[in-house]
Amino acid sequence: DSSKWVFEHPETLYAWEGACVWIPCTYRALDGDLESFILFHNPEYNKNTSKFDGTRLYESTKDGKVPSEQKRVQFLGDKNKNCTLSIHPVHLNDSGQLGLRMESKTEKWMERIHLNVSERPFPPHIQLPPEIQESQEVTLTCLLNFSCYGYPIQLQWLLEGVPMRQAAVTSTSLTIKSVFTRSELKFSPQWSHHGKIVTCQLQDADGKFLSNDTVQLNVKHTPKLEIKVTPSDAIVREGDSVTMTCEVSSSNPEYTTVSWLKDGTSLKKQNTFTLNLREVTKDQSGKYCCQVSNDVGPGRSEEVFLQVQYAPEPSTVQILHSPAVEGSQVEFLCMSLANPLPTNYTWYHNGKEMQGRTEEKVHIPKILPWHAGTYSCVAENILGTGQRGPGAELDVQYPPKKVTTVIQNPMPIREGDTVTLSCNYNSSNPSVTRYEWKPHGAWEEPSLGVLKIQNVGWDNTTIACAACNSWCSWASPVALNVQYAPRDVRVRKIKPLSEIHSGNSVSLQCDFSSSHPKEVQFFWEKNGRLLGKESQLNFDSISPEDAGSYSCWVNNSIGQTASKAWTLEVLYAPRRLRVSMSPGDQVMEGKSATLTCESDANPPVSHYTWFDWNNQSLPYHSQKLRLEPVKVQHSGAYWCQGTNSVGKGRSPLSTLTVYYSPETIGRR
């Protein structure tokens, strides 16, 4: 049952005279709350007396009595889990063992904590990585096994006695696991830091020095080299001699091998600190450096640029860009190996010197077709003039020029003709590969650049063609000027605006939409009979007899076109009324007699009225008046009246004679 009490705290705490000590502590007594607590200094159990001998630094008992030392020593814990302690200030003679005598309802316990108090502030400890290499970031750690809330401290980093400008991260731990103050400094050492002294200085809150730790940096680095050359400017002419010397200014660890490099490539059999070049050629121009290696790696010196001077070599021309598009810009570059660089250039176009062009580059801002041809140049420096090289060819490309659309037919062109057109151009680079035509149609292209329009339409007005290489150039549209007979001929009534009544003045117009040529003649006809040759046909006073089917014709030199037949309708009041009798105007009594009102009217008669010899209207309104059986009294004169939307008309009198039958006569 010894597992009933569980304590957690640092095993040993460190401090110095006049500082303080903060002891983080937790506990657990499973059988209930704490009843009393006594803090002993160096408790020793006396078996004889069954008591602990030692100084009581703090006492918290059931009766609540506490010693005066309690002002310096404080129990900051509680009755069930916290047993944290503070001693402020802490003295040298506080070193030793602290005994926490604790009592619960059922048990007593003594927990021991070690306290190490030094006379003066003890130094922090600098921790370095096992190996430090130049330019590789390392973390320097300064650790001090001390932290106390009542005694603030700071850790400062110094390099050769000067504060380091890198930002350090300071952290403190006051936990049951550990008590410390730590400063971490991220630092990228350079080779020049090798052998330098780094100090971690412990200071109080006011920056007063308390203690320190120092280490000497061992920065592993590649050899650091200096190169010397004779002549010092490293500029020589072909045939001269050159000496280069390599000096090691620092290496950690010691160097092992030496080599020389030209333009990044190792020189064979050159493994000493001196490089001698005798009777140099221009091929020996380049960047030289020495390379010395140690276990860290190779170190290289700065590069020496050896310049072996010579007259320009035969030149070549580079064109940016060929082929060039007309209107674009082109740059010509004269390339000639020379040392020193050429100071003057002469340019040639198709073998002829280009005046005023003395630069390495020739820039033509707007290329034209005549700029095409061969370009060459000559370079010149202080040592001489080079030779003219083979030159470069400039190809200038442009769209087809002066494109025209040509009509091959004899003029004029008539509707329905077959028309042939050709697309012509003056020049083109690259060659024309295709043609385009506007507008598009289902037309034949019997050969490249030729268009055949079968059965040309009256409305084919203009045609344009394009000749195409990489670009298309369009010709101006050409007018076909197709001639055709008048179109859309129709009869149009001008007046009256409403329906035609008998007696009206009437005008008819012969209209057409278009005609080419424009000169036309008109013809009017009714039932095959020619009526007039004007665009209008006029009636001063129209009569019903003028009604009928009219057509007009329009013709030009190409042909003539007829309108659709147009019906002229004349409205008039009933006329030519007469009463006809059936079976005749003499009828025997008892038989049947039918009187019919006949008339001529447009529109037809809509309403009839019958009258007798006394002009008395009869109650009959249909076209036929039927008398059955007819009586002698029906004898007399009858007339009728017809009405339509235009007006009325009346018939003359017609007499009906009804005679007696033989029976009637026999009775008499």
Epitope: Y45, E107, K108
Partner: nanobody
């Protein structure tokens, strides 16, 4: 309230025996330590013998080892059998009871600062 009462003391000749008894009342803990202490005139009180209830482990002062025997019963009463008594064993004998005491996990058989004490009983060894 815990009450302890010692009995069995008295006057005995050197080499003689006595059996001290301690009766406990009002003590409720299941785990405890009982002990016998003595105080001779002009001297500090000293532990004579202790016994632990949990494991029955006993403690004897060097001066009584082999002569005295401590025991207990289930009623929380303890006994000290004293044989081969010597004049220097003359003292007032006290009975004490307390909770177990651990020091960093080590259980003391004779705990520190016993909380409950008897009135004491005189033992005199004299010829």
């Amino acid at each position: 309230q815990v009450k302890l009462e010692e009995s069995g003391g008295g006057l005995v000749q050197p080499g003689g025996s006595l059996r001290l008894s301690c009766t406990v009342s009002g003590f409720t803990l299941d785990s405890y330590v009982m002990g016998w202490f003595r105080q001779a005139p002009g001297k500090e009180r000293e532990a004579v013998s202790c016994i632990s209830s949990s494991d029955g482990v006993t403690y004897y002062a060097d001066s009584v080892k082999g002569r005295f025997t401590i025991s207990r019963d289930n009623a929380k009463n303890t006994y000290l059998q004293m044989n081969s008594l010597k004049p220097e064993d003359t003292a007032i004998y006290y009975c004490a009871v307390d909770k177990p005491f651990y020091d960093g996990g080590y259980l003391y058989t004779c705990p520190v600062d016993f909380d409950s004490w008897g009135q004491g009983i005189q033992v005199t060894v004299s010829s």
